[in-house]
């Protein structure tokens, strides 16, 4: 348990301490206090570097002191022969004696008290980014006007986050632009447009001046754009180093401006606008797009019409065209639909005739009907040749889709009549 | 057939056999049989057979039987209460519509109809073929098909022959332009039981084909001259009747 004060005495004090002893004391005072450790008596065998017998004072990993020999006070008004002031709330005291003592040594008497530390001045690392206020047992940080204390209770920043931009066009600038931006700040701006519009950011080179990168190329102050899983930046330096037009392909963009404690510049200014999300002109074979455009964007509707001899098969129904809409995600609706060759199917049977199986029943295939010769002939002409037409019918040049008609050949006996002479 | 020769059904694949009355007919397409009106006037549901040379019962069982759907007798044919006493055979023509189409082959195929042009006007001496299972010199009915080749003769040749077993005055018998007279050569003639069969003449425009120039109708005496219904005069009626009574499948 932490205590505010205490006494530490070498073994057997004030009698002589024994040989071969190692004893340690862990001193702990409450958080926010330092420790003042002082010795009022010191009588320990002297040796070089206190190698034989010693009392060691350790703070963390640091040895604050190692004592041996005899000491007396330099101040007649004070009994203190040696003292240590540490700005930490923990300290370890270790006493060691070796196997022999040439004389009789009485050891040491020491006392510790919790002392207030000035966190604002006692440390190399300043705990507050702006104003530090010390009090007994602790400190607190405070900020200049228009700054606020971050959740870490140490850093001050400007209140530059939380803005959500939903208008289709707008301008965003760093705090105080074109005056120097605040140090030690993280500014987050959100652009949230209607689905189907992508955020396009436009910057002019001269509208950008942010503390340059260090020698390793790391931005000390940085501007970053995050659109979904895509990131643009970090950007820093004099003059915008990135593309002057950033097409984010997203309707949501987060702009993050991070600054450190030093090197404030004038900052940046950007414009943004919402572009309807583009859809790529997909390669759909055997079809034409209407209307034909160089670029298609969100809500554009095209009619995709199959070329003659091709059709869209959706389920079991054939059509010659379909509509596709450029969707908010930059993809076309009905993208699974394709124009494929028309299949005229198995040719119909005809009475007293036949049709040879075609190699294919697809558009352009040719079939030939023949009649059962010599007993039937093709009455309605056309030669019996049909091709698979674009409308899915087997078509003849003369008859169209009408099937050939095989009618009996008349008046032809298979064998001529020969009169037998009697 | 009097004075004829044995024939094979392949020589006359259009030949149709009627078993009641014993007579003949000519197949003109898949659904229609052409015959003489006097053959069907007494039996409007005749049983017909095609594709067999022999009309022996055992052979007919293996041949193709045709079932009639309807009989169409020419409107100009005068129906009599006592047909046996008939002296007027004008318009002796009828059509039988079949229930099912006939499948054609080497023993079954139709005969052509005459064209309407003057090419199909018969001249005396033009030869025609007759066939049937009717009376022969030897027997009342032939079992195997018989046939003969006869020339067309002037109508007066038929008028001059004395009617054998007349049922009326010789003057009562009617001769009209709707009739063809043929025969008178080597005693070759059609006879009872050959009625309705075709008088087949070679097509003047296609020598490989025969058309039904006439149908066996009547005669004064077997073995002399015979009278045949002049089919050319009825082509319009035949076509109209078939068209009006066909199914879309045939159209």
């Amino acid at each position: 348990e932490p205590t505010m004060y205490g006494e530490i005495l070498s073994p057997n004090y004030p009698q002589a301490y024994p040989s071969e002893v190692e004893k340690s004391w862990d001193i702990e005072v409450p958080e926010g206090y330092g420790i003042h450790l002082y010795f009022t008596h010191l009588d320990i065998e002297l040796s070089e570097n206190c190698a034989y017998d010693s009392v060691q004072i350790i703070s963390g990993d640091t040895e604050e002191g190692r004592l041996c020999g005899q000491r007396s006070s330099n101040n007649p008004h004070s009994p203190i022969v040696e003292e240590f002031q540490v700005p930490y709330n923990k300290l370890q005291v270790i006493f060691k004696s070796d196997f022999s003592n040439e004389e009789r040594f009485t050891g040491f008497a020491a006392y510790y008290v919790a002392t207030d530390i000035n966190e604002c001045t006692d440390f190399v690392d300043v705990p507050c980014s702006h104003f530090c206020n010390n009090f007994i047992g602790g400190y607190f940080c405070s900020c200049p006007p228009e700054y606020f204390l971050h959740d870490d209770m140490k850093n001050c920043g400007v209140n530059c986050s939380g803005d959500v931009f939903t208008a289709l066009i707008g301008e965003i600038a760093s705090p105080n632009y074109p005056k120097p931006y605040p140090e030690n700040s993280r500014c987050e701006y959100q652009i949230r447009l209607e689905k189907g519009f992508q955020v396009v950011v436009t910057l002019r080179r001269e509208d950008f001046d942010v503390e340059a990168a260090d020698s390793a190329g790391n931005c000390l102050d940085s501007l970053v754009f995050v659109a979904g899983d895509r990131q643009f930046g970090p950007y820093c330096g004099h003059g915008f180093p990135g593309p002057l037009n950033i097409e984010t392909k997203s309707n949501a963009l987060d702009i993050i401006f991070q600054t450190d404690l030093t090197g404030q510049k004038k900052g940046w200014k950007l414009r943004y606008h919402g572009d309807p999300m583009p859809c790529p002109k997909e390669d759909t074979p055997n079809s034409v797009w209407e209307p034909a455009k160089a670029k298609y964007v969100f809500r554009d509707v095209v009619q995709i019409t199959c070329l003659d001899g091709f059709e869209v098969v959706e389920g079991r129904v054939g059509a010659t065209s379909f509509y596709s809409t450029c969707q908010s995600n930059g993809k076309w609706s009905n993208s699974k639909l394709k124009c494929q060759p028309v299949d005229c199917g198995i040719p119909e049977s005809i009475e007293n005739g036949k049709v040879e199986d075609p190699e294919s029943t697809l558009f352009g295939s040719v079939i030939r009907y023949t009649c059962e010769e010599p007993y039937y002939y093709m009455e309605n002409g056309g030669g019996g040749e049909y091709h698979c037409a674009g409308n899915g019918s087997w078509v003849n040049e003369v008859l169209g889709p009408e099937l050939p008609k095989c009618v009996p050949v008349c008046g032809v006996p298979r064998e001529p009549f020969e009169e037998k002479q009697r | 057939i009097i004075g004829g020769s044995d024939a094979d059904i392949k020589n006359f694949p259009w030949q149709v056999f009627f078993d009641n009355p014993w007579a003949g007919g000519a197949l003109i397409n898949e659904y229609w049989v052409l015959t003489a009106a006097h053959v069907v006037e007494g039996n409007r549901e005749p049983t017909m057979y095609v594709g067999s040379t022999s009309v022996q019962t055992s052979r007919l069982a293996k041949s193709k039987m045709l079932t009639p759907e309807h009989v169409f007798i020419h409107p100009g044919w005068k129906l009599l209460e006592v047909p046996e006493g008939r002296t007027n055979f004008d318009n002796d023509i009828a059509l039988v519509r079949l229930k099912d189409p006939v499948k054609m082959g080497p023993t079954v195929s139709p005969i052509c109809l005459p064209g309407t042009s003057s090419d199909y006007n018969l001249m005396d001496g033009d030869l025609g073929l007759i066939s049937g299972w009717g009376r022969t010199e030897k027997r009342d009915r032939a079992v195997r098909l018989k046939a003969a080749r006869l020339p067309v003769a002037p109508l007066r040749k038929c008028k001059e022959v004395k009617v054998e077993k007349p049922t009326a005055d010789a003057e009562a018998y009617v001769f009209t332009p709707n009739m063809i007279c043929a025969g008178g050569e080597k005693g070759m003639d059609s006879c009872k039981g050959d009625s309705g069969g075709a008088f087949a003449v070679q097509d003047p425009n296609d020598k490989t084909k025969f058309y039904a120039a006439g149908l066996v109708s009547w005669g004064p005496q077997c073995g002399t001259y015979g009278l045949y219904t002049r089919v050319k005069n009825y082509v319009d009626w035949i076509m109209k009747t078939m068209q009006e009574n066909s199914t879309p499948r045939e159209d």
Epitope: D343, E348, S349, K354 | R249
Partner: antibody, heavy 118, light 109 residues
Framework: EVMLVESGGGLVKPGGSLRLSCAAS????????MSWVRQAPGKGLEWVAT????????YYLDSVKGRFTISRDNSKDTLYLQMNSLRAEDTALYYC???????????WGQGTLVTVSS | QIVLTQSPATLSLSPGERATLSCTAS???????LHWYQQKPGKAPKLWIY???NLASGVPSRFSGSGSGTDYTLTISSLQPEDFATYYC??????????FGQGTKLEIK
């Protein structure tokens, strides 16, 4: 006279196989596309498969695709239906039919009964 | 697939009455490819009317068929005892499958 006579039906366990035959006569078999149609007990007609006159092109009902195979032997005037991986829902009277103009089925066999049951 | 819906499912009429059987397709069907079949219990179906309006061989003239697009009708002008049976409509479409209606049972009232 056109005749179609089916055979090969019977009782089979689920997952089993059967081969149906349809013997054709009275017409030129090789001139006609042919189909199999089935009728479950007390139910309506359901088309199963079609084959072109020469046998090169076949079409199937989706639910039998990959399990049934329609074929024909024009030299024997016979149509076949090889049925594998049979299911209870395949239980039906199976008819073969000739496809006529307009793909009407102008002649049908008397049917052969297939029962799939464990 | 094109679904054929027949109505009514059952039609109860007396001999001599007029019967009207309906077949409605879920999408347009070519009239050349719409057919009707008659089936009697325990028997195979018979082609009855083909290509919408053509009577099959041996079908009496009291039967007629009509229709186009998605609506087709089989009509019997004056019912005879032998006409009581189940009637199926059937369509062919080149993309398949061939489909049948569920049937209309024509029964004696």
């Amino acid at each position: 006279e056109v005749m179609l006579v089916e055979s090969g039906g019977g009782l089979v366990k689920p997952g089993g196989s059967l081969r149906l035959s349809c013997a054709a006569s009275g017409f030129t078999f090789s001139n006609y596309a042919m189909s199999w149609v089935r009728q479950a007990p007390g139910k309506g007609l359901e088309w199963v498969a079609t084959i072109s006159s020469g046998g090169s092109h076949t079409y199937y009902l989706d639910s039998v695709k990959g399990r049934f195979t329609i074929s024909r032997d024009n030299s024997k005037d016979t149509l076949y239906l090889q049925m594998n991986s049979l299911r209870a829902e395949d239980t039906a009277l199976y008819y073969c039919a000739r496809l006529f103009t307009g793909y009407a089925m102008d002649y049908w066999g008397q049917g052969t009964l297939v029962t799939v049951s464990s | 697939q094109i679904v054929l819906t027949q109505s009514p499912a059952t039609l109860s009429l007396s001999p001599g009455e007029r019967a009207t059987l309906s077949c409605t397709a879920s999408s347009s069907v070519s009239s050349s490819y719409l057919h009707w079949y008659q089936q009697k219990p325990g028997k195979a179906p018979k082609l009855w009317i083909y290509s919408t309006s053509n009577l099959a061989s041996g079908v009496p003239s009291r039967f007629s068929g009509s229709g186009s697009g998605t609506d087709y009708t089989l009509t019997i002008s004056s019912l005879q005892p032998e006409d009581f049976a189940t009637y199926y409509c059937h369509q062919y479409y080149r993309l398949h499958p061939i489909t049948f209606g569920q049937g209309t049972k024509l029964e004696i009232k």
